[in-house]
């Protein structure tokens, strides 16, 4: 066989579908690897071929498109299952070729089972809702292309195991689920079940997503440095260990990068010769506000180190702040034996 551009197994596109439900899977070549679409390829005389390797097998085999009721079919660049079976799990390959050109990519397809409460090994998308905000909506995901716009499906929404009907703050509105007000208790999994007819058969699409209620942008503030502060002085003798925590609170901000760093005499610790270590810990509130603590540690501090400027910096999408730690050398306690002896005239 002639050479083929093999993009290998595209594990980034780990496709998971529910057992006994329709699934439409687009060939990833046109979405992620090639610079032209299926229509262009088709009109240029290229043919799209599908084959697969069953789970725990090495043998590539053609896909059987002659199953009863057209259970598996291909339409343009889409592989259709109407519906899936558990043993459809495997690696699928789509290959685009003619006599002079060949390109192919494989991707894993996992058919998963769900229980009556929609629990499954499916990786769930996360949708963040703001607390103390107005009406917010989530939309039943990945149902486009399953039925024509002339078909009016029925949609049922569930919160965990419970059908959403007359809920306190959640209203089903077709493909959307409206949260009149998002409470922390709304955290959890929400499932839409879309039921539609096709050629005398009834199909169900189950889509589950995780809702996480997070801090509102209305309440977001620039980073707040709790430590160091003006009330604490780090007083050390040379040879002692110096430990200074920098503790910073960050409001939740969608897609914000929260950063904390120390400077010593205006330089990053990496750029100076002191033997300094920095340990970081991160904790989150119920609404994903973040507290970061970076502890600056110098095992055996010198008198020179105690004269340096130690500044904690923090930055988020809301702004940048800095605070210097108050560091000083401890004044040695008087040595009473010598002083008393001098007081009695001893030399």
């Amino acid at each position: 066989s002639e050479r083929c551009d093999d993009w290998g197994l595209d594990t980034m596109r780990q496709i998971q579908v529910f057992e006994d439900e329709p699934a439409r899977i687009k060939c990833p070549l046109f979405e992620h690897f090639l610079k032209f679409n299926y229509s262009t390829a088709h009109s240029a005389g290229l043919t799209l071929i599908w084959y697969w390797t069953r789970q725990d097998r090495d043998l590539e085999e053609p896909i059987n498109f002659r199953l009863p009721e057209n259970r598996i079919s291909k339409e343009k660049d889409v592989l259709w299952f109407r519906p899936t079976l558990l043993n459809d799990t495997g690696n699928y390959t789509c290959m685009l070729r003619n006599t002079t050109y060949c390109s192919k990519v494989a991707f894993p397809l996992e058919v998963v089972q769900k229980d009556s409460c929609f629990n499954s090994p499916m990786k769930l998308p996360v949708h963040k809702l703001y607390i103390e905000y107005g009406i917010q909506r989530i939309t039943c995901p990945n149902v486009d292309g399953y039925f024509p716009s002339s078909v009016k499906p029925t949609i049922t929404w569930y919160m965990g195991c419970y059908k959403i009907q007359n809920f306190n703050n959640v209203i089903p509105e077709g493909m959307n689920l409206s949260f009149l007000i998002a409470l922390i208790s709304n955290n959890g999994n929400y499932t839409c079940v879309v039921t539609y007819p096709e050629n005398g058969r009834t199909f169900h699409l189950t889509r589950t997503l995780t809702v996480k209620v997070v801090g509102s942008p209305k309440n977001a503030v620039p980073p707040v440095i709790h430590s160091p502060n003006d009330h604490v002085v780090y007083e050390k003798e040379p040879g002692e260990e110096l430990l200074i925590p920098c503790t910073v609170y960050f409001s939740f901000l969608m897609d914000s990068r929260n950063e904390v760093w120390w400077t010593i005499d205006g330089k990053k610790p990496d750029d100076i010769t002191i033997d300094v270590t920095i340990n970081e810990s991160i904790s989150h509130s119920r609404t994903e506000d973040e507290t970061r603590t970076q502890i600056l540690s110098i095992k055996k501090v010198t008198s020179e180190d105690l004269k340096r400027s130690y500044v904690c910096h923090a930055r988020s999408a809301k702004g940048e702040v800095a605070k210097a730690a108050k560091v000083k050398q401890k004044v040695p306690a008087p040595r009473y034996t010598v002083e008393l002896a001098c007081g009695f005239g001893a030399t």
Epitope: Y133, I135, Y162, Q165, N166, N168, L180, I181, S185, R286
Partner: antibody, heavy 119, light 107 residues
């Protein structure tokens, strides 16, 4: 600390009207919603109505639908319950209560105002 | 509407007793349940929310448990100020509904 104070209760004849107020002192009402809950003499608590803080969406118990109207004046930091076509069975102490913005709970309650419907 | 059934309706107990009040929902309400204490002539006071979370400022002798349809409020060691009526409240489904109340009185 926000406090809620109800007023406007009193004696009214069947078929009459009354407007209850619930004023917040010590800060804005806040929360996710404000509710009216009533308690007939010697009886338990019954939810009546609510208005959402962020969208003015309202909801009513079936027994008061079409007769009671909940509203609010943000500038005055006050909630209202307009009660029309009052019946003897509406006789109760009426409480306003704030729904928390974090969890489903009524975390702040007013002291209540007594409405008596009698001829 | 969801029916909330509390038991017992009246409970006679002494100071220091461990007291348990049960609340049953006619359908599952997850953990969307609160407990309130009410004394004569006063407004209800929130004790427990989210079925088991203690409201700030409420003594730790009060605790809540349960999920779905069965819930309990426990007072580990009854104090003189705890003699009152207790209500459970479901907040998942509209209309909100309360239990009929449990009166805790001195034995």
């Amino acid at each position: 600390e926000v406090q809620l104070v109800e007023s406007g209760g009193g004696l009214v004849q069947p078929g009459g009207s009354l407007r209850l107020s619930c004023a917040a002192s010590g800060g804005t009402i806040g929360g996710s919603a404000v509710h009216w809950v009533r308690q007939a003499p010697g009886k338990g608590l019954v939810w009546v109505s609510r208005i959402l803080t962020y969208s003015s969406t309202t909801q009513y118990a079936e027994s008061v639908k079409g007769r009671f109207t909940i509203s609010r004046d943000n500038a005055k930091n006050t909630l209202y319950l307009q009660m029309n076509s009052l019946r003897a069975e509406d006789t109760a102490v009426y409480y306003c209560a704030r729904g928390s913005s974090e969890y489903p709970k009524f975390d702040i309650w007013g002291q209540g105002t007594l409405v008596t419907v009698s001829s | 509407d969801i029916q909330m059934t509390q038991s017992p309706s009246t409970l006679s107990a002494s100071v220091g007793d461990r007291v348990t009040i049960t609340c049953r929902a006619s359908q599952s309400i997850s953990s969307w349940l609160a407990w309130y204490q009410q004394k004569p002539g006063k407004a209800p006071k929130l004790l427990i929310y989210d079925a088991s979370s203690l409201e700030s400022g409420v003594p730790s002798r009060f605790s809540g448990s349960g999920s779905g349809t069965e819930f309990t409020l426990t007072i580990s060691s009854l104090q003189p100020e705890d003699f009152a009526t207790y209500y459970c409240h479901q907040l998942l489904i509209y209309p909100h509904t309360f239990g009929q109340g449990t009166k805790v009185e001195i034995k």
